[in-house]
């Protein structure tokens, strides 16, 4: 019968011929009366056999990631008779792995959106690197992830590549962050290869800013001839949030005379001071009212940023009109 052990050849061997092992018949007594032959894909070009001894050699550099095993056939012939000594046999040469591939992030570019002020531990995104080396061969393809840029706001789970928030972020201070993640094979041991990827993390807005009047005092004038419903001026508050989080409503907080009203222009987010009832210069030539501004909608968990509405004082001077 045939005698052989499992055949392995390391990939990327630079030697011109590398001894892999020996194929022999147990009928071979070593007197050079048998001839060994190698058949199949790679026979003669990649692998050769010593016809007398059955020693097999690799004569080319192999790349496991291109081809990880070769299935060959062996024959042994009695030189004297030309007849087969053993039935033709199939055998396998496995290409063993070396750590010659760095981890690669295949889904680049990575981009994620996460709400500002999210608590620590909030999941942002998972990045995954792949390593073409053999996952069953030692640690060549066992990866560890680490953060090269992004502290103290982000962390990455070493074995999963899951990026989480590690410190609250405020969109109004910084609205996007570049995080750089490294994947290292060999679980970070000496000889490890690495790859990096960038993740753009954008913060989406939450309603953590209340509208605030730019001015604490406005001065407006109204003619005593102005009919009710007249717009006598505008007031303006600023809200650093965006979109619906910046939508605001203006209202009167104090107006003892009940002479004025404020309506909100939702296009411009301005407050329009309206004359609610006619004024008379001879009766009262100036008024003082206080206006307030609030966001349209504030979720309960964000009320701590909206404890007291901003107000402004409006001084309104009545202009005299000559009366017949």
């Amino acid at each position: 019968g045939w005698v052989w052990n499992q055949f392995f050849v390391p990939e990327e061997m630079n030697t011109t011929s590398h001894h892999i092992g020996q194929l022999r018949s147990d009928l071979d007594n070593g007197n050079n009366s048998f001839q060994y032959k190698l058949l199949g894909a790679g026979a003669g070009s990649t692998f050769i056999i010593d016809e007398r001894t059955g020693d097999i050699y690799a004569i080319q550099k192999l790349d496991r990631e291109e081809r990880s095993l070769y299935i060959l056939r062996a024959q042994v012939i009695d030189i004297a008779t030309g007849r087969a000594v053993e039935p033709e046999s199939e055998f396998v040469i496995k290409v063993s792995d070396i750590n010659d591939n760095e981890p690669k992030f295949l889904d680049e570019p990575y981009e994620a959106i996460v709400p500002e002020m999210s608590p620590e531990g909030t999941l942002v995104i998972q990045v995954t690197a792949s390593d073409a080396d053999d996952p069953s061969s030692g640690n060549n393809a066992r990866l560890l992830y680490s953060l090269l840029q992004g502290q103290p706001y982000f962390s990455v789970e070493p074995t999963t590549g899951v990026i989480r928030i590690s410190s609250k972020m405020d969109r109004e201070l910084q609205d996007e962050y570049w995080v750089i993640i490294q994947a290292k094979d060999m679980i970070g041991q000496p000889g490890a290869l690495s790859g990096t990827t960038s993740v753009l993390i954008k913060l989406s807005d939450v309603n953590d800013n209340k509208p605030i009047f730019k001015e604490s005092l406005y001065r407006l004038t109204v003619s005593e001839s102005a009919p009710t419903g007249t717009s006598i001026g505008t007031i303006m508050a600023y809200d650093n949030d965006i979109g619906e989080n910046a939508e605001m409503d203006y209202s009167i907080e104090e107006d003892d005379s009940q002479t004025f009203d404020i309506i909100t222009n939702h296009e411009t987010q301005e407050g329009i001071v309206i004359l609610k009832k006619k004024v008379d210069f001879e009766h009262q030539n100036h008024y003082g009212i206080r206006a307030k501004v609030k966001n349209h909608h504030v979720p309960e968990q964000l009320m701590k940023y909206h404890t007291e509405a901003s107000t402004t004082f409006i001084k309104i001077q009545v202009e005299d009109v000559d009366e017949p």
């Epitope: 405020d170 969109r171 109004e172 201070l173 910084q174 609205d175 953590d208 800013n209 605030i212 730019k214 001015e215 604490s216 005092l217 600023y238 650093n240 701590k304 940023y305 404890t307 007291e308 509405a309 901003s310 107000t311």
Partner: antibody, heavy 125, light 107 residues
Amino acid sequence: QVQLVESGGGVVQPGRSLRLSCAASGFTFSRYGIHWVRQAPGKGLEWVAVIWYDGSNKYYADSVKGRFTISRDNSKNTLYLQMNSLRAEDSAVYYCARRAGIPGTTGYYYGMDVWGQGTTVTVSS
Amino acid sequence: SYELTQPPSVSVSPGQTASITCSGDRLGEKYVSWYQQKPGQSPILVIYQDNKWPSGIPERFSGSNSGNTATLTISGTQAMDEADYYCQAWDSSTVVFGGGTKLTVLS
């Protein structure tokens, strides 16, 4: 790292002028408004002036209005404070400080998150 | 012009809670920032927008603001917290600082 470094301080006579500089590094200078804040010896902080990220708006404390001018050169990452008609009461350590908040935000709700080490101005005859 | 008033000094024993107040007309309607300044050093922002922490500031520091008074609270006060503290607000395009409070941590 993020840094502001003031220079240009010194001893000057009343009525004379002085120009302070503030060199920024480690961040995108053109995205931030910058303040000048001063502190007289043994006293508290006093705000002096602010300039918006693009130089479009400048505001001053009443105590320096008409005498001091704040400006910036974004190509040089540098802020300036031109101080004219100096008085004894202008003697202080002058700090530049970054206004926290991205472009497009208004107001000074987010504080001053980066400060220089200060430069000393002494107005004395 | 708008004014912010702080007590000149506050004393606290180590491990106790220190409270520093800052008062101003309708201050609760505005947003307040707080700064810590140690002798010979530049100020450091410790609280902004009433109750938010800048990166790197321990959560022993907290802030609140309501009515006419904003408060900086330091829980579990340590010797290293001894410093001057300033409140700051914004009014009509100008910045206003309080007069400062010297926090003494009793030994």
